[in-house]
């Protein structure tokens, strides 16, 4: 039975040209995290494998940095980066947990963080 929940940074906004940290946290389970995949609308951004470390997708290597922790840092943001991001936690023995973050990249200097929320 999957008892865990994923807490994410929720709906967030950032300025064009700036950077943002995408962060998820798995709680309420003793399951072992074997791998975390980061996706942007079905496109792979990065993989963090518990044994092998980080793999950044070639097309994002210049703008994506691993960490902090299992999170991901997006740099040199453009308005095209606006959209949904998913952290996919592969765990044993529970299976897969998915968290969703919506990022809005703003032209203006008004970029405030949204509230945290949980996905069971």
């Amino acid at each position: 039975m999957m008892t865990g929940t994923i807490e994410t940074t929720g709906n967030i906004s950032a300025e064009k040209g700036g950077s943002i940290i995408l962060q998820c946290h798995l709680s309420s389970t003793t399951a072992q995290v074997t791998q975390v995949n980061w996706e942007q609308q079905d496109q792979l951004l990065a993989i963090c494998n518990a044994d092998l470390g980080w793999h950044i997708s070639p097309s994002f290597k210049d703008r994506v940095a691993p960490g902090p922790g299992l999170g991901l840092t997006l740099q040199s943001l453009t308005v095209n980066d606006t959209g949904e991001y998913f952290c996919i936690y592969h765990t044993y023995p529970d299976g897969t947990y998915t968290g969703r973050i919506f990022l809005e990249v703003l032209e203006s200097s008004v970029a405030e963080h949204g509230a945290r929320f949980q996905i069971p």
Epitope: L44, I47, N49, H55, P58, S59, K61
Partner: antibody, heavy 120, light 112 residues
Framework: QVQLQQSGAELVRPGTSVKISCKAS????????LGWVRQRPGHGLEWIGD????????NYNEKFKGKATLTADTSSSTAYMQFSSLTSEDSAVYFC?????????????WGQGTSVTVSS | DVVMTQTPLTLSVTIGQPASISCKSS???????????LNWLLQRPGQSPKRLIY???KLDSGVPDRFTGSGSGTDFTLKISRVEAEDLGVYYC?????????FGGGTKLEIK
Amino acid sequence: QVQLQQSGAELVRPGTSVKISCKASGYTFTIHWLGWVRQRPGHGLEWIGDIYPGGGYTNYNEKFKGKATLTADTSSSTAYMQFSSLTSEDSAVYFCARDYGYDVYAMDYWGQGTSVTVSS
Amino acid sequence: DVVMTQTPLTLSVTIGQPASISCKSSQSLLDSDGKTYLNWLLQRPGQSPKRLIYLVSKLDSGVPDRFTGSGSGTDFTLKISRVEAEDLGVYYCWQGTHFPRTFGGGTKLEIK
């Protein structure tokens, strides 16, 4: 030990397609990338693309987009490359290679190669 | 795409003598993560390629220590301190820093 066993030589007609297989053993197929490389006489080595069997993620060299299709069957630990609309220019030896990915980004084990001859 | 240029095209060496192959890239191969993804392969006659060196200077397991890789930025070198008969074949450098991955044209090592 890591082994990549490729399918046998192919003689195919121009305009048709060919599907080459690469059966992996000796490692966890789903957590490493599997790349494909072409070797034409007098043209050296060309990277076609790679696939992450654990999620079906793919990266293609722009030159081979629409020409090559990479797939993987995790149940049999086999990767496939389909090459379409073949011309005499596609006559070559095609290699699969495990790409460690993560913090190395280097193909460490190679299949024996599959010779494809395009001729009418 | 990053162009990898190898010299010489052919290298004719007497067994026991040293050999050196140069590889130059059209762009720096230093990645934003601080690593340089430059690799060397050897393809012996009639065989598939075999990785010798990765990350500029790290030897693959089973590769004799007479092989050394060095360099940074755009200039790299593969050296063999004392060539042996089993070293003959074509040596390729290739880069994994930039997309797509690209290979050098190869250097054929012949035994005199």
